[in-house]
């Protein structure tokens, strides 16, 4: 039975060519997390964290993806681009799978602020 | 050409160690993890583990956490593999093979370990 | 992580026929899903990645399809030198290989 919930840092905007973190956080549960999934709007897959393997980034998005903090993503250098929906994926033992979704919004101009909250999808 | 090289084939007692090499060469060394993946005769792949040659970071499954270790020479593009406390069912081909983000697109040749009394 | 099940084994066939090898996983493999060619001795060869993608120069006769748990490898018109052991791989949880089909001479 899936008892956790997935928490994530929402809706969130960025300026070009500043960086993000993509945070989700899983909780209300003892499951153990055994890998986590990061997509992109069109199913690309940027970046796997393996609990025994460590941490893996698909090389085109190596120089401007980093891994964490924690089992979170931090994007860099902005563009207009990455502006659109990420998707974090946590396959637990014995839950199954839990996924949550953020939307982030790049914005070009300089005022920009960068806003950010943890919500239940 | 990006090619993987695997030193040859090792015959070894139960309780012995074995270290088998691969030299890298056709790219950058310290730019893509060296994983290392065993099949032992009738059975699936297995991952072993992987080494970062940049900073030498090693992962290990749990099944090869205690007996496994991976090296790595930068200066002469060569990833090891050394796995002591040998018992028959360790004989296999081990092959040392680069990952491409998620998945595996260059492969060695493969090592046969024999571990025989 | 996802097991991996290859079928068939074992499978006999002729120069010229069309060959269908199906991997299935006991998860969902979201289309991160490899396939590999082995031939005795020699170093595993990536044929395609991401169910549908062809390797830079293997040839267009080996496709791949398949979504959710259920994934092909095809060879339209199989060639002398297509006779060997294939395998699948996925790395949606875990990173775990199929058992492999060997695909031999009738």
């Known amino acids: 039975m899936m008892t956790g919930t997935i928490e994530t840092t929402g809706n969130i905007s960025a300026k070009k060519g500043g960086s993000v973190i993509l945070q989700c956080h899983l909780s209300s549960t003892m499951a153990q997390v055994t890998q986590v999934n990061w997509e992109q709007h069109d199913h690309s897959l940027l970046a796997i964290r393996n609990a025994e393997l460590g941490w893996h980034i698909y090389p085109a998005f190596k120089d401007r993806v980093a891994p964490g903090p924690g089992l979170g993503l931090t994007l860099q250098s902005l563009t207009m681009n990455d502006t659109g929906e990420y998707f974090c994926t946590y396959h637990t033992y014995p839950d199954g799978t839990y996924r949550g979704r953020i939307f982030l919004e790049v914005l070009e101009s300089s005022v920009a602020e960068h806003s950010a909250r943890f919500q239940i999808p | 050409e990006v090619q993987l090289v695997q030193s040859g084939a090792e015959v070894k007692k139960p309780g012995a160690s074995v270290k088998v090499s691969c030299k890298a060469s056709g790219y950058t060394f310290t730019e893509y993890s060296i994983y290392w993946v065993r099949q032992a005769p009738g059975q699936r792949l297995e991952i072993i583990g992987r080494i970062d040659p940049k900073n030498g970071r090693t992962y290990y499954v749990d099944k090869f956490k205690n007996r496994a270790t991976l090296t790595a020479d930068t200066s002469a593009s060569t990833a090891y593999m050394e796995l002591s406390s040998l018992r028959s069912e360790d004989t296999a081909v081990y092959y040392c093979?680069?990952?491409?983000?998620?998945?595996?697109?260059?492969w060695g040749q493969g090592t046969l370990v024999t571990v025989s009394s | 992580d996802i097991q991996l099940t290859q079928s068939p084994s074992f499978l006999s066939a002729s120069v010229g026929d069309r060959v269908t090898i199906t991997c299935k996983g006991s998860?969902?493999?979201?289309?991160?899903l490899v396939w590999y060619q082995q031939k005795p001795g020699k170093a595993p060869k990536l044929l395609i990645y991401?169910?549908?993608n062809l390797q830079s120069g293997i040839p267009s006769r080996f496709s791949g399809s398949g979504s959710g748990t259920e994934y092909t490898l095809t060879i339209s018109s199989l060639q002398p030198e297509d006779f060997a052991t294939y395998f699948c791989?996925?790395?949606?949880?875990?990173?775990?290989f199929g058992q492999g089909t060997k695909v031999e001479i009738k």
């Open positions: 093979t680069r990952i491409y983000g998620f998945y595996f697109d260059f």
């Open positions: 998860q969902n493999v979201n289309k991160y």
């Open positions: 791989y996925q790395y949606n949880n875990g990173f775990t």
């Open positions: 991401n169910t549908d």
